[in-house]
């Protein structure tokens, strides 16, 4: 077990904070819930507090709670493959872009770590090329989540790894919106990390709303293990 | 790394902080030239993503940061005679508001020690 690890052995709560500017339209989400990677579980409600949000709720999900893949169950045959956890309580710096197809584009540059016994995740987000009735602007998303795979890679020159997927959000008209994410994650500490051999996250995410929450919000339950390395050859002849 | 340059040339100035986390405070430059008023130049946000520059230097001035390294940087092109000053860098802690708040000119307490710039015709 890393010494980070140890640090998830029950529930642990989360706060996010996002500050963003989509093409000029400037807003903040408070987010908070709770965590437990022993089931890779994630309970979190995330509150716009600057008014409507000018996004869908869906194209931020991933800089929310893929964010904090500290809470992925890792099974026992591939806890020396979690980059996320052993890199705790100091944490790291989370930078990615997000390529919308045929619209425009984010960029987001997070710091997730341990302040006190709270895991935060405090995020910027910079949106640009976006065209205004598309259907990010135009809010044109339904109000759903796919499943997805998180295909998760080392980086060894930076200590770190790189992450690449493609989130397919539904569009009101039975379409598909593809959004291309480019991730890379390194250590804000210098103490050792788990630098993985290439495998993947299977995620599965609920959103729903609060019928008590005035506000602009989204409720979100995420599942998310990870998988892709088999057990090794002394595992399969015991 | 300030400096001398000619009217249409590039300068970068870096300012290197210490005695604080960088990640947790909002970055700018500051510039006052002689005889006038010290003026905001750009700000950035305290990881480095949220950037907002004076009227005067739009598409001209980019700000950068290293937080890993607690540097900030400053690029200057197209430089013109009126961009002759004393550029100084400055710090904040972000604001209870959040990295929206840095681009209060006003609120920067913690200053750098400047350095000279000049561009001739």
């Known amino acids: 077990m890393s010494k980070g690890e140890e640090l998830f052995t029950g529930v642990v709560p989360i706060l996010v904070e996002l500050d963003g500017d989509v093409n000029g339209h400037k807003f903040s989400v408070s987010g908070e819930g709770e965590g437990d990677a022993t089931y890779g579980k994630l309970t979190l409600k995330f509150i716009c507090t600057t008014g409507k949000l000018p996004v869908p709720w869906p194209t931020l999900v991933t800089t929310f709670s893929y964010g904090v893949q500290c809470f992925s169950r890792y099974p026992d045959h591939m806890k020396q493959h979690d980059f996320f956890k052993s890199a705790m309580p100091e944490g790291y710096v989370q930078e990615r872009t997000i390529f919308f197809k045929d619209d425009g584009n984010y960029k987001t540059r997070a710091e997730v770590k341990f302040e006190g016994d709270t895991l935060v995740n405090r995020i910027e987000l910079k949106g640009i090329d976006f065209k205004e009735d598309g259907n990010i602007l135009g809010h044109k998303l339904e109000y759903n989540y796919n499943s997805h795979n998180v295909y998760i890679m080392a980086d060894k020159q930076k200590n770190g790894i790189k992450v690449n997927f493609k989130i397919r959000h539904n569009i009101e008209d039975g379409s598909v919106q593809l959004a291309d994410h480019y991730q890379q994650n390194t250590p804000i500490g210098d103490g050792p990390v788990l630098l993985p051999d290439n495998h993947y996250l299977s995620t599965q995410s609920a959103l729903s709303k609060d019928p008590n929450e005035k506000r602009d919000h989204m409720v979100l339950l995420e599942f998310v293990t990870a998988a892709g390395i088999t057990h090794g050859m002394d595992e399969l002849y015991k | 790394g300030g400096g001398s340059v000619q009217a249409g040339g590039s300068l970068r100035l870096s300012c290197a902080a210490s005695?604080?986390?960088?990640?947790?405070?909002?970055m700018a430059w500051f510039r006052q030239a002689p005889g006038k008023e010290r003026e905001g130049v750009a700000t950035?946000?305290?990881?480095?993503?949220?950037?907002h520059y004076a009227d005067s230097v739009k598409g001209r001035f980019t700000v950068s940061r290293d937080n890993a390294k607690n540097t900030l940087s400053l690029q200057m092109n197209s430089l013109i005679p009126e961009d002759t000053a004393m550029y100084y860098c400055?710090?904040?802690?972000?604001?209870?508001?959040?990295?929206?708040?840095?681009?209060?000119?006003?609120?920067?307490?913690?200053w750098g020690q400047g350095t000279q710039v000049t561009v001739s015709s």
């Open positions: 005695g604080f986390a960088m990640s947790t405070y909002c």
């Open positions: 950035l946000s305290p990881l480095g993503i949220l950037s």
């Open positions: 400055a710090a904040m802690p972000r604001p209870d508001g959040g990295a929206h708040g840095c681009v209060s000119w006003l609120a920067y307490n913690f």
